[in-house]
Amino acid sequence: EDELQVIQPEKSVSVAAGESATLRCAMTSLIPVGPIMWFRGAGAGRELIYNQKEGHFPRVTTVSELTKRNNLDFSISISNITPADAGTYYCVKFRKGSPDDVEFKSGAGTELSVRAKPSAPVVSGPAVRATPEHTVSFTCESHGFSPRDITLKWFKNGNELSDFQTNVDPAGDSVSYSIHSTARVVLTRGDVHSQVICEIAHITLQGDPLRGTANLSEAIRVPPTLEVTQQPMRAENQANVTCQVSNFYPRGLQLTWLENGNVSRTETASTLIENKDGTYNWMSWLLVNTCAHRDDVVLTCQVEHDGQQAVSKSYALEISAHQKEHGSDITHEAALAPTAPLGGSG
């Protein structure tokens, strides 16, 4: 009778994570007497996967009924495959012996590769906001996929970006892989409503890529523009000065009025007008009793936006000669009117 041969017909098998993997093995003979064992890997460090003789292998089932004498099929099925199960599996025939069974012949091995889906991409932006015309970095990360081949693209408002760098780790063989990509995006004033999208394509996704998004509203700061103007008044002893704060983002804004450098009033922006591009407008006014002033008044609108250094705009309010003559009798009193919204610009 010809010497026993161990036949593993498939060089490789690919299975999706969570499924069962069938590893095929056949013998040409039942001689010599002794058990069949399955191992992952070769050499001294190989891992026992199944032993016909003994042991408890809850994830392994034999494809055929091994207690039937004419059975030469020693294929096994491993349930609930994970990326950690990837490797080369060997079907090995042992000859009964002591103190240990003696390895008689091994199959050529079957490489099990596990197709594992990448995790949902997580996109994160810069830790601090930046202003238009500056470049900010966004990162995209996804983990746990296999095989290694993967495609990552970046988009801003549907337009593909080209300024990015991507790494897949580890560089060598592994049970699963991670991808990390950094994209550089130049901010524009209109980016409050913009989105960056990281798109990942992988064999396990069957043409339906995964996407992670980040809003540029989290990364951008649009500083306000200030305009101080005097509004016409019926009463000749009062002046109405407005400070128009325009096109800023985010909302956080504190405004201070100064008369000749002295703080007159501080207020926090509340009722804002939102522009179509996502920025905000706000207007504050100051009623000045001109009778209280003998000389011209410099009114300053000082704005602190989003914790940044204050910006200001001044307006010189001229006191007429007639008002100066009568002014000495007037008690110094600045009438401060409440703020009122100004129509939003679009």
Epitope: Q52, K53, T67, K68, R69, K96, S98
Partner: antibody, heavy 118, light 107 residues
């Protein structure tokens, strides 16, 4: 049903011969290692002989050269030809099937009595 | 040849008792050890193979353990039908050899 039935036992004089038969049913005898085990009256079990699926044969020291194990696949039967019988060969002889992969005994016949006496 | 030694040679016990029979091999036999039960005038019955695996149809009150040279057979709760003679056997290499037997009797 898997079954082994021995026959051929009896009374024989010392130096005589006897041929034991074991008819197998419910399985193909040639696919298994097959054995003969004996038990002298009031004594324990003693393995006597075996034949492997490849036709390889094995014997215990005391019967070597006197006993021959064989099988006939067409009849699905196992045999033990016993020559030069001695008084200490007196025993119940059991036909036994070896297990699938490790040759552990799993199926036993009911036994046949061999008495060697003058 | 490999010698197999059983102890005790005989054992008296009561119904419901838990009993243990030991078997020692003269050399390492891996775990190629079987246990058999035999009742008077009957053929032996296979109980356990590879030291701890139960043959089909054998009740779980029978259990085996051991590897190398020392082995045990345990019957967890004796029933009247369990009183018999028990044999161990090594089948790692020819000639296969049996222990001398342990007779389990009702106390």
């Amino acid at each position: 049903e898997v079954q082994l039935v021995e026959s051929g036992g009896g009374l024989v004089q010392p130096g005589g011969s006897l041929r034991l038969s074991c008819a197998a049913s419910g399985f193909t005898l040639s696919s298994y290692d097959m054995h003969w085990v004996r038990q002298a009256p009031g004594k324990g079990l003693e393995w006597v002989s075996a034949i492997g699926t490849a036709g390889d044969t094995y014997y215990t020291g005391s019967v070597k050269g006197r006993f021959t194990i064989s099988r006939e696949n067409a009849k699905n039967s196992l045999y033990l030809q016993m020559n030069s019988l001695r008084a200490d060969d007196t025993a119940v002889y059991y036909c036994v099937r070896g297990g699938v992969w490790d040759d552990a005994f799993d199926i036993w016949g009911q036994g046949t009595m061999v008495t060697v006496s003058s | 040849d490999i010698q197999m030694t059983q102890s005790p040679s005989s054992l008296s016990a009561s119904v419901g008792d838990r009993v243990t029979i030991t078997c020692r091999a003269s050399q390492d036999i891996n775990n190629y050890l079987a246990w058999f039960q035999q009742k008077p005038g009957k053929a032996p019955k296979s109980l356990i193979y590879t030291a701890s695996s139960l043959h089909s149809g054998v009740p779980s009150k029978f259990s085996g353990s051991g590897s190398g040279t020392d082995f045990t057979l345990t019957i967890s709760s004796l029933q009247p039908e369990d009183f018999a003679t028990y044999y161990c056997q090594q089948y790692v290499s020819y000639p296969y050899t049996f222990g001398q037997g342990t007779k389990l009797e009702i106390k």
